[in-house]
C-alpha cells in the first residue's frame, strides 16, 4: 500500500510548480549541473533520482517532495533505477524544463500512472 | 537564525488528546516545510510527517494518519500538532524541526515536548 | 517502507580511534542517506546529508560514505565529545525511516 497517506500530488499540481520554477528564470539553483536523465524510464524516479543531488536550492524543494511522494507511490518505486547518461550534465533548469515537457505530454494523453 | 521553539512538558489521561506548538524565528516561515518526529524513551526516531506552511499541504507516515494532524498558523509562524486518542503507547519527546539546506533531512530541531500519558 | 538496520547497538571506543558505524538499507536508496548525533537529553544534531557531504560546523573527522544499501559514518580521531547516539534516516522515499541507532561508548 502507498506510503504517504495524503493523496500524492496530481500530475496538474506538478505542472503548476514546475511552470512556477521556470517562468522568467534563465538559471535556478546558481547554475548547479545535474546528471541528465532518460524521462521514460519512470518519469518521477528518474527525475528524483538526477535533483535529488541538489542542496541548498529553496526553489525546488518542493519539486523534489512532489517526485518524491510520486515515486513513493510506485511499486517497489525505491528498486528501479533509471537510465542516467553518466557522461552529460544539463543545468538544473533545463532537467526541470525537460521534465515539465514530458510532463504536459503525459498530462495531454491522459497517461498519468 | 533559524529557531525552533516547542510547547512544554505535557501530562494527559488516556482517552485524552494534547495539540503541541512549534514557534519559528529566523527565517521565512512559508519557504520551508515544518516535520514532526517522535522519540519513544530511549528508542529510535519516528517520522510523523511534514506540513508545507505555503500551501497548508501535509504527508503522513501512514503510522500516525489516525493520531496526528498537522496544522500552522502563518500569521504567527508557528506550527500545531494534534494528537488525540492518546494512551500510553503515545508517551514520547515529539520534536518539530525544519530542512533547510537538504530536502527532507531536519537539521534545525525545536527542543522537543515530552507527552506522558497515564491516569 | 524502507527499513535501515545499524547492525551494531553499541560500539565501544578509546579516545583517538577511528571507528566505523554502518547503516544497511532494504533497497537502494542511492546516496539519500543522512546522519545524525544524539545526546542524552538533547534534540539530534544532523551531520551528514547525502551520504557524505558534512553540514557547516560538523568537525572534518566526521565522514560519511556509501550508496545504495550500504552507508557507514566513520569518526576518526575520537573525541570525548563524540560519545552519542548515532542514527541514519533515508530520505529517498516517503515515508523518510531512521535506523534505530549505535550508542558509541567508551572501552
Known amino acids: 500500500s502507498p506510503s504517504p497517506v495524503t493523496p500524492s500530488p496530481t500530475l496538474k499540481e506538478l505542472i503548476e510548480e514546475l511552470v512556477n520554477i521556470t517562468q522568467n528564470q534563465a538559471s535556478l539553483c546558481n547554475g548547479s549541473m545535474v546528471w541528465s536523465v532518460n524521462l521514460t524510464a519512470g518519469m518521477y524516479c528518474a527525475a528524483l533520482e538526477s535533483l535529488i543531488n541538489v542542496s541548498d536550492c529553496s526553489a525546488i524543494q518542493r519539486t523534489q517532495r512532489m517526485l518524491k511522494a510520486l515515486c513513493s507511490q510506485k511499486p517497489a518505486a525505491g528498486q528501479i533505477s533509471s537510465e542516467r547518461s553518466r557522461d552529460t550534465k544539463i543545468e538544473v533548469i533545463q532537467l526541470v524544463k525537460n521534465l515539465l515537457t514530458y510532463v504536459r505530454g503525459v498530462y495531454r494523453h491522459g497517461n498519468f500512472r | 537564525e533559524v529557531q525552533l521553539q516547542q510547547s512544554g512538558p505535557e501530562l494527559v489521561k488516556p482517552g485524552a488528546s494534547v495539540k503541541v506548538s512549534c514557534k519559528t524565528s529566523?527565517?521565512?516561515?512559508?519557504?520551508?516545510?515544518i516535520y514532526w518526529v517522535r522519540q519513544s524513551h530511549g528508542e529510535s526516531l519516528e517520522w510523523i510527517g511534514y506540513?508545507?506552511?505555503?500551501?497548508?499541504?501535509?504527508t503522513y507516515n501512514q503510522n500516525f494518519k489516525d493520531k496526528a494532524t498537522l496544522t500552522v498558523d502563518k500569521s504567527s509562524s508557528t506550527a500545531f500538532m494534534h494528537l488525540n486518542s492518546l494512551t500510553s503507547e503515545d508517551s514520547a519527546v515529539y520534536f518539530c524541526?525544519?530542512?533547510?539546506?537538504?530536502?527532507?533531512?531536519?537539521?534545525?530541531w525545536g527542543q522537543g515536548t515530552s507527552v506522558t500519558v497515564s491516569s | 517502507d524502507i527499513v535501515l538496520t545499524q547492525s551494531q547497538k553499541f560500539m565501544s571506543t578509546s579516545v583517538g580511534d577511528r571507528v566505523s558505524i554502518t547503516c544497511k538499507a532494504s533497497?537502494?536508496?542511492?546516496?539519500?542517506v543522512a546522519w545524525f548525533q544524539q545526546k542524552p537529553g538533547q534534540s539530534p544534531k544532523a551531520l551528514i546529508y547525502?551520504?557524505?557531504n558534512r553540514y557547516t560546523g560538523v568537525p572534518d573527522h566526521f565522514t560519511g560514505s556509501g550508496s545504495g544499501t550500504d552507508f557507514t559514518l566513520t569518526i576518526s580521531n575520537v573525541q570525548s565529545e563524540d560519545l552519542a547516539d548515532y542514527f541514519c534516516?533515508?530520505?529517498?522515499?516517503?515515508?523518510?525511516?531512521f535506523g534505530a541507532g549505535t550508542k558509541l561508548e567508551l572501552k
Open positions: 524541526a525544519t530542512a533547510v539546506v537538504a530536502t527532507d533531512v531536519m537539521e534545525n
Open positions: 529566523g527565517y521565512s516561515f512559508t519557504d520551508y516545510p
Open positions: 506540513i508545507d506552511p505555503y500551501n497548508g499541504g501535509t
Open positions: 533497497q537502494n536508496v542511492r546516496n539519500a
Open positions: 547525502l551520504a557524505s
Open positions: 534516516l533515508q530520505h529517498w522515499n516517503y515515508p523518510l525511516t
